[in-house]
């Protein structure tokens, strides 16, 4: 007779990351009897929802249900039917919805209301949709990467089970770049966090952490580009904007109404004598870098030191995981290797931006032109943000690790969010630790 496998005693959780440019659904799985162990939760699926971010549905809220269908149906397939009713579903919306809320609380609520009604139609245990704060986004990203790196585990190992592990309990800082905001989160070294808004206290697995975090709204890569265009068109002599952040030969028409649609460009808004203008790429890294630096106000700092725009930033400490768009952009540019110095990254960006647009299109024929056209800007922006914004140096660059996944789970805020909401990170170290996969018997 054939042995029947015992049914796995596992649990599942679903988190939807409703970002400014798109929504992704993540499915997590963990052994039911090891809920309080560190590192046992892992991602089993990521489903990218086709279409833009939910904030773009403000004029067509009736389409939200259809928009979410494919990924929710995928979740239905991946998670065993017997587990559906006890699988929690959370949706967290980030900076795209924060911006919409700044424009209109009513419109933001209307979008979330339809999202909630749509998600309630599935057989899972829907726990609500909300706009998370920038502070939460930073904190949960920090929890995610340190949880996956095993930094909260009190077991010392003579071997490494995860990449980047330095075999100590020193946590990694988290650098997250989205379309509409960017977050920096880390434990400073014996430094008072001078601004209370940027201070977080955690007790995780019996250890206290004093964490610095800040989310820069409007400094995600997409909104930063809108800001730069709005700033530069102010001084353009006509409806042609010669832009160093786009490849030579690149041309694109932009509607002024689209440029001023976002609250991020309000500070640059002016009455222009034209309704449209044309971007003409000239592909010059150095000039692009200079233009981007004008978005960072470094002239004012009410603290001992600042990042930019008068925001306190303690001295950088330890290693950092840079994920989300930091990783996607650098991966595309083939600049994620630990061996590539900051000087080399800059050199490669200079070469990349100077390449003619026709040549770029041929070399990357499979990439959508909308995305392809913006890698020169995005790569330059990442360098500007990390070096001039956050004060990384050529020396400390080696402490930045561009991370897509850790142990098969995406780096990002969603895992930390779920761990927190399902109470899976205990404040105290569990008394007895069951044998885990990293223990030899």
């Amino acid at each position: 007779t054939q042995n029947k496998a015992l049914p796995e005693n596992v649990k599942y959780g679903i988190v939807l990351d409703a970002g400014s440019s798109h929504t992704s659904l993540y499915i997590y799985k963990w052994p039911a009897e090891k809920e309080n162990d560190t590192g046992v939760v892992h991602q089993v699926e990521e489903c990218r929802v086709k279409g833009p971010g939910i904030s773009k549905f403000v004029q067509k809220v009736n389409e939200i249900g259809i928009y979410l269908t494919d990924c929710m149906e995928r979740a239905r397939e991946v998670i065993p039917r017997s587990q559906h009713q006890e699988t929690p579903v959370y949706l967290g919306a980030t900076a795209g919805m924060r911006l919409l809320r700044m424009e209109s609380e009513e419109l933001a609520d209307r979008v979330l209301d339809v999202v909630e009604r749509s998600l309630s139609n599935y057989p899972f245990d829907f726990q609500g949709a909300r706009i998370i704060t920038g502070q939460e986004e930073g904190a949960y990203g920090w929890i995610t990467i340190n949880y996956l790196l095993g930094k909260f585990s009190q077991k010392t190992r003579w071997f490494s089970i995860v990449p980047y592990e330095t075999n100590n309990q020193e946590t990694f800082g988290a650098l997250d770049l989205g379309g509409a905001s960017t977050q920096v989160t880390f434990v400073p070294q014996n430094q008072t966090i001078e601004s209370p808004d940027n201070a977080l206290q955690f007790r995780l697995y019996g250890k206290d952490y004093n964490v610095y975090t800040h989310s820069f709204l409007c400094y995600g890569k997409d909104q930063a580009l809108w800001q730069k265009l709005a700033k530069d068109i102010q001084v353009a002599s006509n409806e042609i904007l010669r832009d160093p952040c786009f490849h030579p030969g690149y041309k694109k028409v932009v509607n002024v109404s689209d440029l001023y649609k976002t609250p991020c460009t309000k500070r640059f808004e002016m009455t222009l004598p034209f309704q449209q203008f044309e971007i003409q790429g000239i592909g010059n890294y150095q000039q692009c870098h200079q233009s981007i630096l004008e978005l960072f106000n470094t002239s004012y700092c009410p603290y001992s030191q600042c990042a930019f725009n008068g925001i306190f930033l303690p001295p950088l400490q330890g290693d950092f995981g840079a994920f989300s768009a930091f990783y996607f952009v650098m991966k595309f540019l083939n600049l994620t290797s630990e061996k590539v110095s900051q000087e080399k990254v800059t050199e490669m960006m200079k070469k990349f931006c100077a390449q003619p647009w026709e040549e770029i299109k041929t070399s990357y024929a499979g990439v959508k032109e909308k995305y392809l056209s913006e890698y020169c800007f995005s790569g330059t922006y990442i360098l500007s943000l990390l070096l001039q914004g956050y004060h990384f140096t050529a020396d400390s660059w080696e402490h930045i690790h561009f991370i897509g996944k850790i142990q098969g789970s995406d780096a990002g805020w969603t895992l930390g969010y779920m761990l927190n909401l399902t109470n899976m990170i205990p404040a105290e170290q569990p008394l007895s630790t069951p044998l885990s996969h990293s223990t030899y018997v």
């Epitope: 403000v58 004029q59 809320r101 700044m102 424009e103 209109s104 609380e105 009513e106 419109l107 609520d109 209307r110 706009i131 609250p263």
Partner: antibody, heavy 117, light 110 residues
Amino acid sequence: EQQLVESGGGLVQPGGSLRLSCAVSGFSLSKSIISWVRQAPGKGLEYIGIIGSSGSTYYANWAKGRFTISKDSSKNTVYLQMGSLRAEDMAVYFCARGLLYSGNKSWGPGTLVTVSS
Amino acid sequence: DIVMTQSPDSLAVSLGERATINCQSSQSVLLNNQLSWFQQKPGQPPKLLIYDASTLESGVPDRFSGSGSGTDFTLTISSLQAEDVAVYYCLGGYSGNLYAFGGGTKVEIK
């Protein structure tokens, strides 16, 4: 069934202060926008301000500084604190759930504030 | 400051006839369509009739309709009934969580 009821209106002297309450039931304050609107006797509707689901507040330019909106979600109540009251502040004060989309039963009946010496 | 100008101030229309009320905003409303119309009867709070410039609130008779975009909007009562006697207000929603009511239009039977 959702319901909003204003209270706290009455007679106040010029220069005085008053706090109006808006008690809500049938829905969660933590997920709702509440607005305050007033109407002077025989006059039109005038927007005062709103408090968002996250607690953010926004005001009409004329109301900034003198009027403050707050809420206590545990008591299901939103407040309108009014200071330096003048004769022209005499009106019926309404609270509403939302504003542009304030559907059926989304408005309270109103509370009258009289400013007089 | 944003100014919402509503016209006429008052309107007398025969039963069964069409009534038209206009609202003009000093700046474009959010998304060009964030405009609502309210009906208010004496001693009552306002009642929502139309939102998104042209969407009829549920339970509102279809003789009420709204049109317009950007800065110019119209409320039409296609066939005035006795119960439609009231004051009508437009309300615009603007970028930055700003709002402005029109001055109101009193509708009476001729």
